[in-house]
């Protein structure tokens, strides 16, 4: 979609943004490409917050300028400079917060003309789940247990022998706190474990579903964990 | 290229304010911030402070009551001043450019300048 | 704050080993390490940031790694010229700190 702007006689170019979700604690990155240029000078990146009055970063003619950036994000952001000529205005985010969740816009400036776009920028704590055979239990059990989540996730546990099956009799789940008061461990319990099945153990938030599988057989013991970040979707 | 470069006093006086001044050249202050880092005779890097790109500080709470940073971005330079100077406080100071706009790791330092606190 | 523990203290190596420097933090601190190395009379000189990457200009026997806690320095070669104090630091939160450093003797 072209959009042509009589008072600057430039056009609108396209700029397309990924929703994501940062884990506190570690690095984020927000995604936003754009229609590349030719010449690096000609191109400006703000990347701006809703609620937020100075800016988040800022790229102009070959680096970067931060005199308006705002003190929450002081030391904390960069953009790809290598790749900017090329139409990549990602930006990384050291140490992700809480409070680092909102509505982003990615703003771009090129020689072609003007163009933005909003991002949902959801922040938590996620981490794979690690199931085990609780060999100190009286009898056969299986302890799931994944060290980082927020906000408090649901545990359910599936089996593949008994499809359908609602285990929340026989299983325990508890959330213990972490030392930083934010984030919580996570450690369920499932009882009467028979041989020869696989069982899952299944945590999910508003941000992430993670999943770790295991298959006890009288010769083996098989894992298998994933996880996959909830809503990310483009615009 | 990137350059920093400190000019202070040399000999301060117990009790007394040392100032330090930080010239750069090479990039500009309003795109980095420069931080502060000494070291004590014999002993390791002490991380100081730092002044940002906009002007906020962040002040390592150890000195945060005697220590403040400060900049005029036009001259490109960075103004260092520490209160109440004891024996202690005798090392090396140096002013230090990040690598990137995230913190990874100081790449460029000035030649740093002694600060010796005797009466 | 955040407590950097580098081992050893100090070593004396011949030409051509490979020498091993560790940097233990007290808390998490991802793979915001930096490792630099200081020559007498000299400041110190960026060799590895981020954990793992080199500087620019940093020879290649200078290697990185870890991330969380534990990060080492490798020296795959070591060079008379390498004789020097070697300091790692955190900058994944304030206040910033730094290892006691290491001081590296050519035997």
């Known amino acids: 979609l072209i959009i042509g702007f009589g008072i600057s006689g430039r056009h609108s170019i396209t700029v397309t943004t990924v929703a994501s979700a940062g884990n506190i604690g570690e690095d984020g990155i927000l995604s936003c490409t754009f229609e590349p240029d030719i010449k690096l000078s000609d191109i400006v990146i703000q990347w701006l917050k809703e609620g937020v009055l100075g800016l988040v970063h800022e790229f102009k003619e070959g680096k970067d300028e931060l005199s308006e950036q705002d003190e929450m994000f002081r030391g904390r952001t960069a953009v790809f400079a290598d790749q900017v000529i090329v139409g990549n205005a990602s930006l990384r985010l050291k140490n992700v917060q809480l409070t680092d969740a909102g509505t982003y816009k990615c703003y771009i400036i090129t020689s072609k003309g003007k163009g933005n776009a909003n991002l949902e920028y959801k922040t938590g704590a996620f981490s794979m789940p690690e199931v085990n055979v609780d060999y100190n239990a009286s009898s056969e059990t299986l302890r799931c247990e994944a060290p980082r989540w927020f906000p408090q996730p649901t545990v359910v546990w599936a089996s593949q022998v008994d499809q359908g099956a609602n285990f929340s009799e026989v299983s325990n789940t508890s959330f213990e706190l972490n030392s930083e008061n934010v984030t919580m461990k996570v450690v369920s319990v499932l009882y009467n474990v028979t041989i020869n099945n696989t069982y899952s153990c299944m945590i999910e938030n508003d941000i992430a579903k993670a999943t770790g599988d295991i298959k006890v057989t009288e010769s083996e013991i098989k894992r298998r964990s994933h996880l996959q970040l909830l809503n990310s979707k483009a615009s | 290229q990137i350059q920093l470069q400190e000019s202070g006093p040399g000999l301060v006086q117990p009790s007394q304010s040392l100032s330090i001044t930080c010239t750069v050249s090479g990039f500009s202050l309003t795109s980095y911030g420069v931080q502060w880092v000494r070291q004590s005779p014999g002993k390791g890097l002490e991380w100081l402070g730092v002044i940002w790109s906009g002007g906020s500080t962040d002040y390592n709470a150890a000195f945060i009551s005697r220590l403040s940073i400060s900049k005029d971005n036009s001259k490109s330079q960075v103004f260092f001043k520490m209160n109440s100077l004891q024996a202690d406080d005798t090392a090396i100071y140096y002013c230090?450019?990040?690598?990137?706009?995230?913190?990874?790791?100081?790449?460029?330092w000035g030649q740093g300048t002694l600060v010796t606190v005797s009466a | 704050n955040i407590v950097m523990t580098q081992s050893p203290k100090s070593m004396s190596m011949s030409v051509g080993e490979r020498v091993t420097l560790s940097c233990k933090a007290s808390e998490k601190v991802g793979t915001y390490v930096s490792w630099y190395q200081q020559k007498p009379e000299q400041s110190p000189k960026l060799l590895i940031y981020?954990?793992?990457n080199r500087y620019t200009g940093v020879p290649d026997r200078f290697t990185g790694s870890g991330s969380a806690t534990d990060f080492t320095l490798t020296i795959s070669s070591v060079q008379a010229e390498d004789l020097a104090d070697y300091h790692c630091g955190q900058s994944y939160s304030y206040p910033f700190t730094f290892g006691s450093g290491t001081k590296l003797e050519i035997k």
């Open positions: 981020g954990a793992s």
């Open positions: 230090a450019r990040d690598i990137t706009t995230i913190v990874e790791g100081f790449a460029h």
